[in-house]
């Protein structure tokens, strides 16, 4: 039975050219995390496997850094980075847990004027 829950940073905004940490946390379970997949809509950004360690997609390796922990740091953000990100926790013996983060990258001038992404 899956008893765990995934907590994420939820809906976040960041400035163009800046950086952001995508973070998920699995709680309320003693299951062993065997692998975490970080996905952005249709592509795989990175995996962190308990036996193999981190592998980052070459398309993102200049802008993506592993960590902290099982999280992912995105750097040199562009407006094209806006969208949904998913952390997929593969665990033993529970199975798979998925968390969702929505990132909006704002133009610097917009960010400076205090605009922030919100879901009513």
């Amino acid at each position: 039975m899956m008893t765990g829950t995934i907590e994420t940073t939820g809906n976040i905004s960041a400035e163009k050219g800046g950086s952001i940490i995508l973070q998920c946390h699995l709680s309320s379970t003693t299951a062993q995390v065997t692998q975490v997949n970080w996905e952005q809509q249709d592509q795989l950004l990175a995996i962190c496997n308990a036996d193999l360690g981190w592998h980052i997609s070459p398309s993102f390796k200049d802008r993506v850094a592993p960590g902290p922990g099982l999280g992912l740091t995105l750097q040199s953000l562009t407006v094209n980075d806006t969208g949904e990100y998913f952390c997929i926790y593969h665990t033993y013996p529970d199975g798979t847990y998925t968390g969702r983060i929505f990132l909006e990258v704002l133009e610097s001038s917009v960010a400076e004027h205090g605009a922030r992404f919100q879901i009513p």
Partner: nanobody, 118 residues
Framework: EVQLVESGGGLVQAGGSLRLSCAAS?????????MGWFRQAPGKEREFLAI???????LYADSVKGRFTISADNAKNTVYLQMNSLKPEDTAVYYC???????????WGQGTQVTVSS
């Protein structure tokens, strides 16, 4: 116990192609976190090549991107590595690995030898 069996290796001339297969047998699982290909040349460390998730998302090493293609047939519990434009430096033992969702550890195949002659 799950076993991974690679096949398709052999001797090929530079510029040629090979398709490797990795079949999972035994107590197979309904889904996997990833299945991937690695290689090890004599006297060198194991090198990551490509990974595919059960959602068919892929990730490649810089050294093979554009030349190698990973794919999977989930109905057959098999993952493939299509290798094109092979070079002598691609000579190595090629290993398949899988992280099944409901498995505690990574599973490795026994390897298949690929030799690229110039």
């Amino acid at each position: 116990e799950v076993q991974l069996v690679e096949s398709g290796g052999g001797l090929v001339q530079a510029g040629g192609s090979l398709r490797l297969s990795c079949a999972a047998s035994g107590r197979t699982f309904s889904s996997y976190a990833m299945m991937g290909w690695f290689r090890q040349a004599p006297g060198k460390e194991r090198e990551f090549l490509a990974i595919i998730t059960d959602g068919s998302k892929t990730l490649y090493a810089d050294s093979v991107k554009g030349r190698f293609t990973i794919s999977a047939d989930n109905a057959k519990n098999t993952v493939y590595l299509q290798m094109n434009s092979l070079k002598p430096e691609d000579t190595a033992v090629y290993y398949c690995a899988a992280q099944f969702t409901l498995a505690r550890h990574l599973v490795w195949g026994q390897g298949t030898q690929v030799t690229v002659s110039s």
